[in-house]
Interface confidence: medium
């Protein structure tokens, strides 16, 4: 079974319990499928590792917000 730090991941069964600095993150996707045991966010890191995270946690929401803004305002 996939755990909090496993790749590739379709469903998440455990969440990472440690914040990940956004500079290590490349993208994210939300998991809302009824086939999965829980709603989740899967972050893909810059080294292509996929990490399951709890969308209810502040740091996860912040990271998604940050990545969204980074796409809108790329580095000059």
């Amino acid at each position: 079974q996939p755990d909090a730090i496993n790749a590739p991941v379709t469903c998440c069964y455990n969440f990472t319990n440690r914040k990940i600095s956004v500079q290590r993150l490349a993208s994210y996707r939300r998991i809302t499928s009824s086939k999965c045991p829980k709603e989740a966010v899967i972050f893909k890191t810059i080294v292509a590792k996929e990490i399951c995270a709890d969308p209810k946690q502040k740091w996860v929401q912040d990271s998604m917000d940050h990545l969204d803004k980074q796409i809108q305002t790329p580095k000059p």
């Epitope: 600095s21 956004v22 500079q23 502040k58 740091w59 912040d62 940050h66 803004k69 305002t73």
Partner: antibody, heavy 120, light 107 residues
């Protein structure tokens, strides 16, 4: 133990320039983001600028944007702040501080600060 | 940037509980950090991620954050706790915002 030592402060005339340095030791400098925070005499703390651990992104307070430039040399374990077009309101103690995560920029270690005085 | 508001001063008798508030719009959705600064010294982190204590910080320091208000609580306040206290938060684009600071006086 973690040590951050600022230098380069002093008296400068309005419109002048100054370059602050912060020498880091006791930790893996290249793994941490770094910041400058200032404190005007008798006033509160004001965040000035951040730079990511690899130097890839920089962020500035609106009050210094376009005048100040943050940079780092990971081979020398040193953080810099180039301050141009200085104004009287830039007078403050300037602290360098480290942080681990972005965007949760909080400062677990601080230097003792260097005083910048802008006056004619 | 997020605007953080603190009371300018709080007084407490030794041994009593001091509470310092920090308010801002939807602050509970962000992590809040607290620093202690004594005269002539650099700030020291006393609470991170709302309610966590760094190693070396006494257990009498605690934090909470919900709604629009974060609170630093010092239980059994001691004379050595007299200092300025600053709350701090951040934005998604990695800027940091500080509250105006609160001077804690131990009577």
């Amino acid at each position: 133990q973690v040590q951050l030592v600022e230098s380069g402060g002093g008296l400068v005339q309005p419109g002048g320039s100054l370059r602050l340095s912060c020498a880091a030791s006791g930790f893996t400098f290249r793994s941490y983001g770094m910041s400058w925070v200032r404190q005007a005499p008798g006033k509160g703390l004001e965040w000035v600028s951040n730079i990511r651990s690899d130097g890839s992104y920089t962020y500035y307070a609106d009050s210094v944007k376009g005048r100040f430039t943050i940079s780092r040399d990971n081979s020398k374990n040193t953080l810099y702040l180039q301050m141009n077009s200085l104004r009287a309101e830039d007078t403050a103690v300037y602290y360098c501080a480290r942080f681990e995560f972005t965007p949760w920029t909080y400062f677990d270690f601080w230097g003792q600060g260097t005083l910048v005085t802008v006056s004619s | 940037d997020i605007e953080l508001t603190q009371p300018p001063s709080v007084s407490v008798a030794p041994g009593q509980t001091a509470r310092i508030s920090c308010s801002g719009d939807n602050l509970g959705k962000k992590y809040v950090y607290w620093y202690q600064q004594k005269p002539g010294q650099a700030p020291v982190l006393v609470i991170y991620d709302d309610d966590n204590r760094p190693s070396g910080i006494p257990e009498r320091f605690s934090g909470s954050n919900s709604g629009n208000t974060a609170t630093l609580t010092i239980s059994g306040t001691q004379a050595e706790d007299e200092a300025d206290y600053y709350c701090q938060s951040y934005t998604a684009q990695s800027s940091a915002s500080f509250g105006g600071g609160t001077k804690l006086t131990v009577l």
